[in-house]
């Protein structure tokens, strides 16, 4: 058993049929010695008396808010949550496996640049009695500070018969060094509580591996005289790290016909312009990627050819 | 070439070679063998390799003030990785394919380090750690980890040389 926060405790249980459970001793936070009784949740049934209460925690029916009283007055509370371990593996019932980029990916994170700011998100099908708390650091043995905001519900989607809820959080490394080569990963830890179930999820990454630039901006076409060719130009996104001579991007320019089956013409360039042939009803798209480190491509920025 | 006393390196040549190194480091990575182990090998070998850190002067401001600190750090790393790529980790079982880009990568690391270090002038180099793989699966795991950290190292080096070529070239 360990304390999650004041008066909230997590009991770790091996979860299998007829498991013996854990013996837990609760102590009433009071100078009083006599006449103390204990109840669980809203029930008025007295579970025991005395300054301490010993219980065998085996299942969710044994978890909840234990309250000690004296003469009708509440003295203190202890909320017990359960953390299940099945066959040596902690349960992951609350969050959905996003399966990208690999199985057992519950948290996904992205950064728009090297400033040390990043966003993480996760999915659940649970709509009520759900709380999240997020902590982060750079490294784990001698952790350096990363400040995270509160997790918020950022999207709702309907998937078949189910509703899916997306939560996200923004974090900022306290003393980021954008030009350095990271040697210690960022660690993100999410505590999730649904009713009386506690779970924790972690992700470990380097900012360089979660970089996804915003799409190029100001995408423009300039027809070339007496030619089917056009000059496409664009600019670095505002959110990308500066100076651009140091934090350089590379670009992919694509000409795509109306039909998805039509052959795509692609050009790769380090410049912020390219010359392509504009076909009727086609569109031109450009996306960006870090020039020197193959993290994610941005989403496409597009303009019609006409 | 860099010369003692802090003259400029051939920024443009270094830029081209470091960009080639980036490409080679990424093309070598998937080709060192099928690898599920990398998904689980969470303990970092990167504690054992030189990093371009915050105080090394490799940021734009530091390069403007005095690029020598940064170039020395890059040179140290290039020699270090060149030694690792020539070690038993990459030459032992399982054998790399004959056309593996690791050979080219090895040669390019040496080429860039020579561009940075003139004859008769020696910067300190770091000892190569004893990672002591005794099994082929351990070598394979280390190859992935070393190439992953090399990708990060050469990305910073390439940014340094690109910025130098754009702003510090004579």
């Amino acid at each position: 058993i360990w304390e999650l926060k004041k008066d909230v405790y997590v009991v770790e249980l091996d979860w299998y049929p007829d498991a013996p459970g854990e013996m837990v001793v609760l102590t009433c936070d009071t100078p009083e010695e006599d006449g103390i009784t204990w109840t669980l949740d809203q029930s008025s049934e007295v579970l025991g008396s005395g300054k301490t209460l010993t219980i065998q925690v085996k299942e969710f029916g044994d978890a909840g808010q234990y309250t000690c009283h004296k003469g009708g007055e509440v003295l203190s509370h202890s909320l017990l949550l359960l953390h299940k371990k099945e066959d040596g593996i902690w349960s992951t019932d609350i969050l959905k496996d996003q399966k990208e980029p690999k199985n057992k990916t519950f948290l996904r994170c992205e950064a728009k640049n090297y400033s040390g700011r990043f966003t993480c998100w996760w999915l659940t099908t649970i709509s009520t009695d759900l709380t999240f708390s997020v902590k982060s650091s750079r490294g784990s043995s001698d952790p350096q500070g990363v400040t995270c905001g509160a997790a918020t519900l950022s999207a709702e989607r309907v998937r078949g018969d189910n509703k899916e809820y997306e939560y996200s959080v923004e974090c900022q490394e306290d003393s980021a060094c954008p030009a350095a080569e990271e040697s210690l990963p960022i660690e993100v830890m999410v505590d999730a509580v649904h009713k009386l179930k506690y779970e924790n999820y972690t992700s470990s990454f380097f900012i360089r591996d979660i970089i996804k630039p915003d799409p190029p901006k100001n995408l423009q076409l300039k027809p070339l005289k007496n030619s089917r060719q056009v000059e496409v130009s664009w600019e670095y996104p505002d959110t990308w790290s500066t100076p651009h001579s140091y934090f350089s991007l590379t670009f992919c320019v694509q000409v795509q016909g109306k039909s998805k089956r039509e052959k795509k013409d692609r050009v790769f360039t380090d410049k912020t312009s390219a010359t392509v042939i504009c076909r009727k009803n086609a569109s031109i798209s450009v996306r960006a990627q870090d020039r020197y480190y193959s993290s994610s491509w941005s989403e496409w920025a597009s303009v019609p050819c006409s | 070439r860099a010369v003692p006393g802090g003259s400029s390196p051939a920024w443009t040549q270094c830029q081209q070679l470091s960009q080639k190194l980036c490409t080679l480091a990424w093309s070598a990575h998937p080709l060192v063998g099928h690898m599920d182990l990398r998904e689980e090998g969470d303990e970092e070998t990167t504690n054992d390799v030189p990093h371009i850190q915050c105080g090394d002067g490799c940021d734009p401001q530091g390069l403007r003030d005095n690029s020598q600190f940064c170039l020395q750090r890059i040179h140290q790393g290039l020699i270090f990785y060149e030694k690792l790529l020539g070690s038993d980790i990459f030459t032992g079982e399982p054998s790399l394919l004959p056309d593996s880009p690791v050979g080219q990568l090895h040669a390019s690391l040496l080429g860039l380090s020579q561009l940075l270090q003139p004859e008769g002038h020696h910067w300190e180099t770091q000892q190569i750690p004893s990672l002591s793989p005794s099994q082929p699966w351990q070598r394979l795991l280390l190859r992935f980890k070393i190439l992953r950290s090399l990708q990060a190292f050469v990305a910073v080096a390439a940014r340094v040389f690109a910025h130098g070529a754009a702003t510090l070239s004579p």
Partner: antibody, heavy 121, light 111 residues
Framework: EVTLKESGPVLVKPTETLTLTCTVS????????ISWVRQPPGKALEWLGV???????NYNSGIKSRLTISKDNSKSQVVLTMTNMDPVDTARYYC???????????????WGQGTTVTVSS | DIVLTQSPDSLAVSLGERATINCRAS??????????MHWFQQKPGQPPKLLIY???NLESGIPDRFSGSGSRTDFTLTISSLQAEDVAVYYC?????????FGGGTKVEIK
């Protein structure tokens, strides 16, 4: 289908040399390492040695001086030679494939049926 | 050499009940976060069969009532609901250092 089949004498005399052959099919010896493992009657398993994809070998230090493992990739055969046999070497000898280096980390994923070798005069 | 000590030596479990076998190594069998510990099942007259590789990965074709956990020096094989066909001897094996070594085996029977 992956198969490994051990062949060789059932009975050898003390001080003689044992030669066992493992013939494999369904995979190439240039892609997978082969180990030899033995099991005395009613006892636990003992690893003898391995021949890697490139032909290098590692042996159990306890019997290293008596062991040689070689292979012929084109014939898909691995040969175990063990000199100066003794009654304590009586065991079932297994030829075993080591799983893909990058996934299995030294786990042995396919085993032959084994061949029982008795050392007796 | 790395010595692997299995416990218990034998285990009698009722059908449908849980069986847990432990394997302790005399030194760590982890290398940069990878546990080179594997589990085998051997039935009478048959060669061993790989069940779990790298401490916790289920070999294809093995029922998911088998699971493995642990790292460094302490490892566990669990059969969540024992079936009649699970009666066998179970061995752990390490491949972190030469020579590869096996545990002494744990015999699982039905109570």
């Amino acid at each position: 289908e992956v198969t490994l089949k051990e062949s060789g004498p059932v009975l050898v005399k003390p001080t003689e040399t044992l030669t066992l052959t493992c013939t494999v099919s369904g995979f190439s010896l240039t892609s997978y390492a082969i180990s030899w493992v033995r099991q005395p009657p009613g006892k636990a398993l003992e690893w003898l040695g391995v021949i890697w994809t490139g032909g290098g070998t590692n042996y159990n230090s306890g019997i290293k001086s008596r062991l040689t493992i070689s292979k012929d990739n084109s014939k898909s055969q691995v040969v175990l030679t063990m000199t100066n046999m003794d009654p304590v070497d009586t065991a079932r000898y297994y030829c075993v494939r080591e799983g893909d280096y990058g996934s299995y980390a030294g786990a042995m994923d396919y085993w032959g049926q084994g061949t029982t070798v008795t050392v007796s005069s | 050499d790395i010595v692997l000590t299995q416990s218990p030596d034998s285990l009698a479990v009722s059908l449908g009940e849980r069986a847990t076998i432990n394997c302790r190594a005399s030194e760590s069998v982890d290398y940069y976060g990878i546990s080179s510990m594997h589990w085998f099942q051997q039935k009478p007259g048959q060669p061993p069969k790989l069940l779990i590789y790298r401490a916790s990965n289920l070999e294809s074709g093995i029922p998911d009532r088998f699971s493995g956990s642990g790292s460094r020096t302490d490892f566990t094989l669990t059969i969540s609901s024992l079936q009649a066909e699970d009666v066998a001897v179970y061995y752990c094996q390490q491949a972190n250092k030469d020579p590869y070594t096996f545990g002494g085996g744990t015999k699982v029977e039905i109570k």
